[in-house]
């Protein structure tokens, strides 16, 4: 009776009980990852004069205590709000740069325009990026060997939810001209099922936001197509006009041109076409 | 839709010499052009392009030897320094995009002879 | 530089015959399919045979075919007509908005 009302709190059925050692079809937990976060978290707090308030062994725990012991399909946003709290957090107004399958260069966008900010630019984004992690019901181990796939296993694991956890918030809190960063290289230059389609467009603000720019950047090939009248582009412009913010739309031909001019607005080459 | 050539002649070695593409039935703010020459007897050799963003391209070879600007109808090719080996017929093409990537509407060509 | 390399100067084949052109590229073309072929008969300007590796341009008898993916490429002409005989380039697009041409291939019809 008391092992059911552990089951029956946890939602899990008896068919999903774990074995002694779950194996899922995602790669482990990222090796050294309490470690990992914790040197992340001073990093980041030392570097960051309005985060030096904050105890990074209180983070760590809050980060632990959000999947240790629990089943890792059976993970709720609600099992991060301890963690969030304490990442608290504001960007400026104008400054959000949100990304879609492009990550790499809105990094290298943020690294030459300081003042503006990705989520991974944000305490709790740059604690996670790039890592893997779970734990195992009624243990208090991490996961090394595997974890579960998005696809393949479960939505609702630690990785995914943590990501449309502070996903959400972070669109939630941005004001003014929100900006996004699309890779115009893909099928869908806006899909629906990114985190960015799924999770921060319903959660902007229209009461804060003005409005959406998005770039859409053109792969290693610049051709001449005005990729902002692009099928799918032209759904996230009814997606957000429909939440009463304003959308507006660029082209961004040469990706390396456009960060060397973010670099150099003086130089001559950038009057000219980006 | 169509592209023509024009503005070739002959010349002599070093004086500079602009070729124009004239366009219709389309708009050069959302097309590329190509400039592509075919020396006597040879085959085709791809010079440069212009985008509609006014992004240019060049081949390695060509760089410094040729210029390639647009106005709203047309797209110019200057030869900055010709020599006898840029004796050549100069065709212009549009460039396709995407999933449609080729060459799909030339010019019949304009001959430019370089000769002392 | 990025190379497109027609290993054959000419071919020929009779009447209601099939020919093949290959062109092979020293890297790949941007997105494995930036790849198109023309054909190039004296005194007519140049005409856009294949676009995309495979996409037949509108226009063009499906006699003319379009094959290959990333570096290795293939234009086949089957029954061929006296109307064929040409010269046959494959022009290549590469990452970086560079392009290239192959050195052409004539076509001979017996």
């Known amino acids: 009776s008391g092992l059911n009302d552990i089951f029956e709190a946890q939602k899990i059925e008896w068919h999903e009980l774990p074995r002694w050692r779950q194996q899922w079809s995602g790669s482990g937990t990222t090796s050294r990852f309490p470690e990992t976060v914790l040197a992340r978290c001073v990093k980041y707090t030392e570097v960051h004069p309005e985060m030096r308030h904050v105890d990074c062994q209180s983070v760590w725990d809050a980060f632990k205590g959000a999947f240790i012991s629990k089943y890792p399909c059976n993970i709720t946003e609600e099992d991060y709000q301890p963690l969030v709290k304490l990442g608290t957090q504001t960007v400026p107004c104008n400054k959000t740069l949100l990304w879609s399958r492009i990550k790499d260069l809105a990094h290298q966008f943020t690294q030459v325009q300081r003042d503006m900010f990705t989520l991974e630019d944000m305490l709790l984004g740059y604690l996670a990026d790039d890592l893997t992690w779970c734990g195992e019901f009624n243990t208090f181990e991490i996961n090394y060997q595997s974890c579960p796939d998005w696809r393949k296993d479960c939505s609702n694991n630690p990785v995914s939810v943590f990501w449309k956890t502070v996903s959400r918030r972070f669109a939630e809190t941005a004001c003014g001209v929100v900006h996004v960063m699309l890779n115009g290289s893909r099928s869908k230059i806006f899909d629906k099922n990114s985190t960015f389609g799924s999770v921060e467009v319903h959660n902007l603000q229209p009461e804060k936001v003005q409005a959406l720019e998005a770039w859409v950047i053109h792969g290693g090939r610049e051709d001449s197509r005005d990729l902002c009248q692009d099928p799918t582009i032209k759904e996230l412009e009814s997606i957000i006009s429909k939440r009463n913010i304003r959308f507006f739309c660029k082209n961004i031909y040469r990706p390396d041109k456009f960060l060397q001019c973010v670099k150099n607005p003086e130089d001559s080459s950038c009057l000219s076409g980006i | 839709q169509s592209v023509e050539e024009s503005g070739g002649r002959l010349v002599t070695p070093g004086t500079p010499l602009t070729l124009t593409c004239t366009v219709s039935?389309?708009?050069?703010?959302?097309?590329?052009i190509s400039w592509v020459r075919q020396a006597p007897g040879k085959g085709l050799q791809w010079i440069g392009s212009?985008?509609?963003?006014?992004n240019t391209y060049y081949a390695t070879w060509a760089k410094g030897r040729f210029t390639v600007s647009k106005t709203s109808t047309t797209v110019d090719l200057k030869i900055n320094s010709p020599t006898t080996e840029d004796t050549a017929t100069y065709f212009c093409a549009r460039e396709g995009a995407g999933s449609s990537w080729g060459f799909n509407l030339w010019g019949p060509g304009t001959l430019v002879t370089v000769s002392s | 530089a990025q190379v497109l390399t027609q290993t054959a100067s000419s071919v020929s084949a009779a009447v209601g015959g099939t020919v093949t052109i290959s062109c092979q590229s020293s890297?790949?073309?941007?997105?494995?399919?930036?790849l198109s072929w023309y054909q190039q008969k004296p005194g007519q300007p140049l005409k856009c045979l294949i676009y995309?590796?495979?996409t037949l341009a509108s226009g063009v008898p499906s006699r003319f075919k379009g094959s290959g993916s990333g570096t290795q490429f293939t234009l086949t002409i089957s029954d061929l007509e006296s109307d064929d005989a040409a010269t046959y380039y494959c022009a290549g697009g590469y990452s970086g908005n560079i392009n290239g041409f192959g050195g052409g291939t004539e076509v001979v019809v017996k």
């Open positions: 212009i985008y509609g963003s006014g």
């Open positions: 995309s590796a495979s």
């Open positions: 039935g389309f708009s050069l703010s959302n097309n590329a």
């Open positions: 890297e790949s073309v941007y997105k494995n399919n930036y």
